[in-house]
C-alpha cells in the first residue's frame, strides 16, 4: 500500500527589513503569467543568497505571498506585483503562505519510529 | 561563456540621437538578462536600462526614463540602446552587461553585482 501525501497550509507574517540590494528574492505569478493552475497568486521563485530573506529565513521558495504591507495581492499583474514589492518601503511585511508537504504512512498503520501516540 | 561586443558610441551634440548596439556571443541568448550600465569620469558605474526577455520586463533608470528605450533582437543575439534627447550629463562609458535569468523576476532593483558578464564599453560624449 502506498503512502498518501497531505500538505500542511500554514500563514506567517515576515517583517522584512530592506537589505542593500533589496529584499533578497524572487517572484512567479500573477493574472497575466499563472504558476498554478487556476491561481493567480504570488510566488517565491527564488531566494537570494545572503539577501535580506535568506537572512531572515523564514520565506521560502514556494511560499505563495498573500499581501504587502497589508496590501492584497490578488488579481495582480505580473510587473504590478513586482512594482508593489519594488516601491515598498525600507521596512516590509509580508502575509505569507507556506505549503509542508507531509508524507504519511499507509492509512493504519503506524510505523515504529512515528512518535506520535 | 557568454561574450558582449557593444558600438555606436561617438561625439553628439546636446539633443541629438544615437544607438548602442550589443551583440552577444557563446550563450542561449534569451534566457540572459541584458542590461545597459554607464560610468562618467570620477563617478561610479551606474544602471541604465535592463530587458529580461523571459520576464517579459523592461525597466530604467529614472534619469534616463522616457528618453532612452532599450530593446532586444533575439534572432541578431544583439540589445540596443536608443538614446534621444542627448544631455550632457549622458557622457560616459556605456557597458553592456549580461546575467542568466533565474525564474521569475527579482522583486529588488538591477543590481551590477548580479551580473557576471560584462563588455569593454563604448565611450559617448554629448557636448
Known amino acids: 500500500m502506498n503512502g498518501r501525501v497531505d500538505y500542511l497550509v500554514t500563514e506567517e507574517e515576515i517583517n522584512l527589513t530592506r537589505g542593500p540590494s533589496g529584499l533578497g528574492f524572487n517572484i512567479v505569478g500573477g493574472t497575466d503569467q499563472q504558476y498554478v493552475s487556476n491561481d493567480s497568486g504570488i510566488y517565491v521563485s527564488r531566494i537570494k543568497e545572503n539577501g535580506a530573506a535568506a537572512l531572515d529565513g523564514r520565506l521560502q521558495e514556494g511560499d505563495k505571498i498573500l499581501s504587502v504591507n497589508g496590501q492584497d495581492l490578488k488579481n495582480l499583474l505580473h510587473q504590478d506585483a513586482v512594482d508593489l514589492f519594488r516601491n515598498a518601503g525600507y521596512a516590509v511585511s509580508l502575509r505569507v503562505q507556506h505549503r509542508l508537504q507531509v508524507q504519511n504512512g499507509p492509512i493504519g498503520h503506524r510505523g515504529e519510529g512515528d512518535p506520535s501516540g | 561563456q557568454v561574450q558582449l561586443v557593444e558600438s555606436g558610441g561617438g561625439l553628439v551634440q546636446a539633443g541629438a540621437s544615437l544607438r548602442l548596439s550589443c551583440a552577444a556571443s557563446?550563450?542561449?541568448?534569451?534566457?540572459?538578462?541584458m542590461a545597459w550600465f554607464r560610468q562618467a569620469p570620477g563617478k561610479e558605474r551606474e544602471f541604465v536600462a535592463e530587458d529580461s526577455w523571459s520576464n517579459h520586463r523592461v525597466w530604467y533608470s529614472d534619469s534616463v526614463k522616457g528618453r532612452f528605450t532599450i530593446s532586444r533582437d533575439n534572432a541578431k543575439n544583439t540589445v540596443y540602446l536608443q538614446m534621444n534627447n542627448l544631455k550632457p550629463e549622458d557622457t560616459a562609458v556605456y557597458y553592456c552587461a549580461a546575467y542568466r535569468d533565474y525564474s521569475g523576476s527579482t522583486v529588488d532593483p538591477p543590481n551590477q553585482s548580479e551580473y557576471n558578464y560584462w563588455g569593454q564599453g563604448t565611450q559617448v560624449t554629448v557636448s
Open positions: 557563446g550563450g542561449t541568448f534569451s534566457s540572459y538578462a
